[in-house]
Each structure stands twice: as C-alpha cells, then as structure tokens.
C-alpha cells in the first residue's frame, strides 16, 4: 500500500494509506510553515518549502538524526510549489510572491529563472522528465493551467475555463493524464496532458482542497478545512474514505514510491549532455538543452556558459 | 513611519465581552490583509482572525469561532475584534498586524505570524472572574 508523504506546516510526515492503525510518522518536525514537498526516491531524499523562512529544505528518510540541509536560502518569498526531476536531478519551484519559476541542481546551485512574466499567483507543479514537459497552476486574476518544457521553452496555456482556485496539480505517468482539484469550484478534474478531453472526477463535495497526488487507480489529497487527507477512484471519484484526520494543517502531498518517479536514461547523463552548467530536459530534439544561471550567457557553442557563471 | 496601536483591553469576567481597536498610520490602509493574534503567557503566538482587503472575506481560528468577529473601516483606517462569550483560556495579549500580501482563504500564509509585515505593541486581555 502507498506511503503518502505530505507537509504539515510545523513538520513532514509519513503516513501507509492501507494501515490497518493509520498514525503518521514525522519525518522532520520544528518547522515553520512547511507548504511544498517532495522526493528523490533513489536517494530516498525529502525537500520541501518552507515559506515562512522563505527556504527549500533537505533531509533524508531512514537515516537516524539525518540532518536539515539548506538548498536554497535567499531570493524566495512564497515557494508555493516543489517538484523534483529525479531523472535529470533538478529542483523546480514556483514563488507566488516573486511571480517566478525556477530551477536549479538538487544542492541549489546554479539556479535559473525559467519564467518571471505573466504570473500571477503559481502555485502547484508537476512534470513529466520522459516527456521533458513541466506544468503549473496559477490561480490569480486569470486562473489557468500551463505547461512548458522542462528547459523554458514552447510555453502554452492548457486550461483557462470553469478553473478559479487550481490549486492541486499531478500527473499520472501511466496514462499520460492531468488531474487537478479547484478548491473554489469544490472539483477534481483531469483531461489529456495537453488539456484535452476533460472530465469530472469528483464535484461538488469537496470543502478546500490543497494537493493532490496518485497511486495506481486512487487519487490522495490534502484538505484545509477539514484538516485531513482523502482518496478516491482516479476514473469515477467512487470509493471515497478518508485516510488521516485531526491534522495540524495538511499542505503538499506525494506518493513516496519507485513508481512515482521511473528511471531512464537520458543525454544529461553522459558527461551533463556536454554542459557547463544546468543540462535540463526538453520535449523536442535532441530532448536536452544547456542552460545557464540567471545573468549568466550561453556562449555560442550552446553547451558553455561565458565567465561569471 | 508605519504604526499599529491596539486599544480596548483590560479586565473581563467570564462570559463576557470586549472590543478591541487597532489605529493603523503610515500605510494605505485599505491594500492591507488586516489581522489578529495573540500570545498567552509561555505560549506561541497564535491566529486568531483576519479581515481581506475589501473587508469582503473574515477568516478565524477555530477556537474563537461564533464568539469573535473581526470587521474593519477603511474610513477610518481601523480594524476590530468584538469578542464575546469571553473564557479564562481567552486571556492573552492581542497584536494587531497588517499583511499586504493576503488574498483570501486560498492564501498559503494568511494564518501565519511570520508573514505579517507590521506589528501592533499589543493591549492585555485578563478573563477572570
């Protein structure tokens, strides 16, 4: 059965979905405003935001007193959302304060600004490394759902009708679907990953719901007003049961799983695809593209970034 | 220079009421996120209501629920907590604070302290009988 790994504000916990005794376990506790989380499965590493301190966060499961590393500690406001690419090991997040999406390696260095115009309030993000896409929510002014590649490029809008509130966001790997809950509309939609073919999954029963996750046939999330985590059929939203309640304040959740994150194998392994610096995964050929950190210029050759970097 | 100053505590029995004010000079008032927290002895610093911008949308802790209502005068550059029903557990003192980035209930940091950009001294609630 599924480990859910979620923020609860003041810590990050785990909970098994099909326990018989469903208790949480804290996985790092002490904290501030634990918002965004999520994983590297091969390295059984935890990140997570904490937009009180305006920090991304590390530490890592099954190790006794492992320790709380910073990854990223200056230029944050609001790191609403996380998503690790475990494939080509970098960190993305989106700020809705900044009104920015970022990368940068697992360990925070060279960190790139991908977009910083026409955001509102982006909040959830998701990818999807095999097809080098990433997508996020933005639930301000002109609510939407986007997607992007991975490296910045071929930036579209997907979603921008019946959507107020977007604010979880997954992708099912498997059957290449979108899922996202609207906490305004009181919803769980999905639709094809390039926002076609969209259909109900849940309407009209849900109180605020925050992050929303998946395993196999069922669909978690996290719930403001009630303080808890529920699940469902990911196809007809039947099933319904709630996994753990009486929580502090349940924020982000993910599936902590191998399945979660498949492994294979891409040009950015190979000696970083010939890059100096930031080799990140693209949706068309050759699927990679070096990259720089912000204020930094490509030089000519596209693989070296000039002097500074 | 920005200046929240609280007013409207002191001594209560239980069961009783209080309104506190909070006089805000120094900002524009009205693109302000207002609220409330307060901080018993030997205890964290805790929400307890806000007010949106507009004045539209109230949020609150679930333990002051039905008891306390946050409202505001843009007018008057002031903020209020009526708070009725009042119990020993009540007492604390209550800071007023302003957060110009709040939008609402679907903001991550509405109920958090640490956000708040501006900060009142604070004025004594005691409920006792």
């Known amino acids: 059965s599924p480990l859910l790994l979620f923020a609860n504000r003041r810590d990050v916990r785990l909970v098994d979905a099909g326990g018989v005794k469903l208790e949480s376990t804290i996985v790092v506790s002490g904290l501030e405003d634990a918002a965004a989380v999520d994983f590297q499965f091969s390295k059984g590493a935890v990140y997570w935001t904490d937009v009180s301190e305006e920090a991304i966060k590390q530490t890592y499961l099954n190790q006794t007193g492992a320790a709380v590393q910073n990854v990223v500690i200056s230029g944050l406001v609001s790191p609403d959302g996380l998503a690790c690419d475990w494939v080509g090991k970098k960190l993305y997040w989106t700020d809705s304060e900044t009104n920015r999406i970022e990368v940068a390696n697992l360990n925070g260095t060279s960190r790139k600004v991908l977009f910083w115009q026409d955001l509102d309030q982006p909040r959830a993000i998701a990818l999807d490394p095999a097809h080098g896409y990433m997508y996020w929510t933005d639930w301000g002014e002109t609510p939407r759902i986007e997607r992007a590649g991975m490296d910045g490029s071929t930036r579209k809008i997907i979603v921008d009708s019946d959507i107020y509130w977007p604010n979880g966001l997954t992708i099912d790997l498997e059957e290449q679907k979108l899922y996202w809950a609207d906490a305004k509309l009181s919803f769980i939609h999905r639709a094809n990953l390039d926002g076609s073919f969209r259909q109900k999954v849940v309407e009209g029963s849900l109180t605020h719901p925050f992050a929303l996750t998946l395993s196999g046939d069922t669909l978690y999330w996290t719930d403001w007003q009630t303080r808890s985590i529920h699940a469902c059929n990911k196809r007809t939203g039947g099933k319904r049961k709630e996994i753990l309640s009486a929580l502090y304040s349940p924020m982000d959740i993910q599936v902590l799983s191998q399945e979660r994150q498949p492994f294979f194998h891409t040009r950015c392994e190979e000696d970083n695809g010939g890059c100096s610096h930031l080799c990140l995964l693209s949706p068309s050929e050759p699927f990679y593209t070096c990259a720089c950190p912000t204020g930094v210029q490509l030089q000519d050759n596209g693989r070296t970034c000039k002097a500074g970097a | 220079a920005v200046q929240l100053v609280e007013s409207g505590g002191g001594l209560v029995q239980p069961g009783g009421s209080l309104r506190l004010s909070c006089a805000a000079s120094?900002?524009?008032?009205?693109?302000?996120?207002m609220g409330w927290f307060r901080q018993a002895p030997g205890k964290e610093r805790e929400f307890v209501a806000a007010?949106?911008?507009?004045?539209?949308?109230?949020y609150y802790a679930d333990s002051v629920k039905g008891r306390f209502t946050i409202s505001r005068d843009n007018s008057k550059n002031t903020v209020y907590l009526q708070m009725n029903s009042l119990r020993p557990e009540d007492t604390a003192v209550y800071y007023c604070a302003a957060d110009r980035r709040g939008r609402g209930e679907n903001y991550i940091l509405l109920y958090s302290s640490g956000r708040y950009e501006y900060w009142g001294q604070g004025t004594l609630v005691t409920v006792s009988s």
């Open positions: 007010i949106v911008r507009s004045g539209g949308s109230t």
């Open positions: 120094g900002l524009t008032f009205s693109r302000y996120t």
